[in-house]
């Protein structure tokens, strides 16, 4: 039994960020005379939270009128709680003096702030990679409390297992951050694929937050090249076609070379998309056979997405006497990159 007891009935109070927190405190006696003050923390470094007599505490209001006669309720309400408000709050009775003397402290009420995690931000690799390569995606979310949190990765709805996740700091803090890295093996079919980082936390009431990244930002699908020649036309012109297929992204430059000299350069633009998200492009070159004495070496050179150029070359054999109109050509493959046309 004591002359004066300072009663803080709740050991802990949990409040959602943005809400108000009520910290309860009653005293068993108003004697001896002296103020009640609220502090966060204990010891010499404690922070004054509320003092009726002096100071400006815009977010703190007394629950009961402290100037009312016989008022023994010194509870306070703190508005617009943020994670920075977390801590243990003490209601302390002082005895009037010069200076006032601390008489009795309440047992303290621990205020924990339930703060929602920020929307997960997923970032992919800085440079694109091709199929069969592994790329890393990073997911970050900040500002949540309490520390317990669940993070999962999905690719096209399937959970990923090659994941490393850290929550910081390891010790006690007003709020926490999570960072997770997922490793994904790319396939040529991943242009339309998506990775999702899903964060579940007590503050989200079963409705997790999701961050997404499109593998289209991370993948490069190199093109296939095929060069073909149509029948020789009556005007001794040969129509040579360079088919560039199944590539992504669209950024592609095609150059025709005749005997090593640039004939024409084209940039791909506004191409229709294949079902799998890749693109196809066909370029034609008309070669006037009668204008050449010697064989013509044609090269289709493709530079895709800043990568080293890929070539397909073939030779057009210039005949001593002109072909009959409409005759077919026979092609013999003399190498992976060269075709001779007779």
């Amino acid at each position: 039994e004591e002359e004066l007891q300072v009663i803080q009935p709740e050991k802990s109070v949990s409040v959602a960020a943005g809400d108000s927190a009520t910290l309860n405190c009653t005293v068993s006696s108003l004697i001896p005379v002296g103020p009640i003050q609220w502090f966060r923390g204990a010891g010499p470094g404690r922070e004054l939270i509320y003092n009726l007599k002096e100071g400006h505490f815009p977010r703190v209001t007394p629950v009961s009128d402290p100037t009312k006669r016989n008022n023994m309720d010194f509870s306070i309400r703190i508005s617009n709680i943020t994670p920075a408000d977390a801590g243990t709050y003490y209601c302390v009775k002082f005895r009037k003096g010069s200076p006032d003397v601390e008489l009795k402290s309440g047992a303290g009420t621990e205020l924990s702030v339930r703060a929602k995690p920020s929307a997960p931000v997923v970032s992919g690799p800085a440079v694109r990679a091709t199929a069969e390569h592994t790329v890393s995606f990073t997911c970050e979310s900040h500002g949540f409390s309490p520390r317990d949190i669940t993070l999962k990765w999905f690719k096209n709805g399937n959970e990923l297992s090659d994941v490393q996740t850290n929550v910081d700091p390891a010790g006690k803090s007003v709020s926490y951050s999570i960072r997770s890295t997922a490793r994904v093996v790319l396939t040529r079919r991943d242009v339309h694929s998506q990775v999702i980082c899903e964060v579940a936390h007590v503050t989200l009431q079963g409705d997790p937050l999701r961050g997404t990244a499109n593998l289209s930002e991370a993948i490069r699908v190199p093109p296939f090249l095929e060069v073909t020649q149509q029948s020789m036309r009556a005007d001794n012109q040969v129509n040579v076609t360079c088919q560039v297929t199944k590539f992504y992204p669209q950024r592609l430059q095609l150059t025709w070379l005749e005997n090593g000299n640039v004939s024409r350069t084209e940039m791909a633009s506004a191409l229709p998309e294949n079902k799998d998200g890749t693109y196809n492009w066909t370029s034609w070159l008309l070669v006037n056979v009668s204008a050449h004495r010697d064989d013509v070496k044609l090269t289709c050179q493709v530079e895709h997405d800043g990568q080293p150029a890929v070539n397909k070359s073939f030779s057009v054999k210039v005949s001593a006497h002109p072909k009959e109109q409409g005759s077919n050509t026979a092609a013999e493959n003399t190498g992976t990159n060269e075709r001779n046309i007779y």
């Epitope: 039994e1 004591e2 002359e3 006696s29 108003l30 004697i31 001896p32 005379v33 002296g34 103020p35 009640i36 009726l52 007599k53 009128d65 402290p66 100037t67 009312k68 006669r69 016989n70 008022n71 005895r95 009037k96 003096g97 003397v101 008489l103």
Partner: antibody
Framework: QVQLQESGPGLVKPSQTLSLTCTVS????????VNWIRQPPGKGLEWIGI???????DYNAALKSRVTISKDTSKNQVFLKLSSVTAADTAVYYC????????WGQGTTVTVSS | DIVLTQSPASLAVSPGQRATITCRAS??????????MHWYQQKPGQPPKPLIY???NLESGVPARFSGSGSGTDFTLTINPVEANDAANYYC?????????FGGGTKVEIK
């Protein structure tokens, strides 16, 4: 129940030190303060001082230079020492519990006389 | 020091009548929304007995015939109706500022 009982010599010579004991029961001296109050014959009450539960003290400035209040919590006793007494210190001395003075001892009469 | 002046110094009242004692402080005894003024009854040969604390609160076991009022510097103790065993000295006391002080007392006699 709460009880306070003053004890000490009824007669003290001038210039000597008056020493009184207040023995308490029914409450803890760590949780409650104890006051000393005196009442000269036929006069009003005068507050001497208080020793708080934490053993800190507050005294009447008019007597402060001569007063010491202490306690032995384990024995449930509070002590008053008043030095350099004169006839003006003749009074009934009371101890009373806490800032509220809600319980009083019966008082002990001290006469200062040679 | 806060000086407490009680009036009247003495008062004779018939049983069943109202007795009113006033206590004026030389400065306010109010702090933190409360008046740190208390009233005691003392009968000859006995220690003071607490009646009222914080200006208007009745101590446990004290009859409701006793009441207190006032704030700041002016306080009143009322006994209504007075009974024969109310004959005693009545003291006001403040513990808002050191040194704690008592009024000079009011002697209530029953006619």
């Amino acid at each position: 129940q709460v009880q306070l009982q003053e004890s000490g010599p009824g007669l003290v010579k001038p210039s000597q030190t008056l020493s009184l004991t207040c023995t308490v029961s029914g409450f803890s001296l760590t949780g409650y303060g104890v006051n000393w109050i005196r009442q000269p014959p036929g006069k009003g009450l005068e507050w001497i001082g208080i020793i708080w539960g934490d053993a800190s003290t507050d005294y009447n400035a008019a007597l402060k230079s001569r007063v010491t209040i202490s306690k032995d919590t384990s024995k449930n006793q509070v002590f008053l020492k008043l030095s350099s007494v004169t006839a003006a210190d003749t009074a009934v001395y009371y101890c009373a519990r806490a800032g509220k003075m809600d319980y009083w001892g019966q008082g002990t009469t001290v006469t200062v006389s040679s | 020091d806060i000086v407490l002046t009680q009036s009247p110094a003495s008062l004779a009242v018939s049983p069943g009548q109202r007795a009113t004692i006033t206590c004026r402080a030389s400065e306010s005894v109010d702090s933190y929304g409360n008046s740190f003024m208390h009233w005691y009854q003392q009968k000859p040969g006995q220690p003071p007995k607490p009646l009222i604390y914080l200006a208007s609160n009745l101590e446990s076991g004290v009859p409701a015939r006793f009441s207190g009022s006032g704030s700041g510097t002016d306080f009143t103790l009322t006994i209504n109706p007075v009974e024969a065993n109310d004959a005693a000295n009545y003291y006001c006391q403040q513990n808002n500022e050191y040194p704690w002080t008592f009024g000079g007392g009011t002697k209530v006699e029953i006619k």
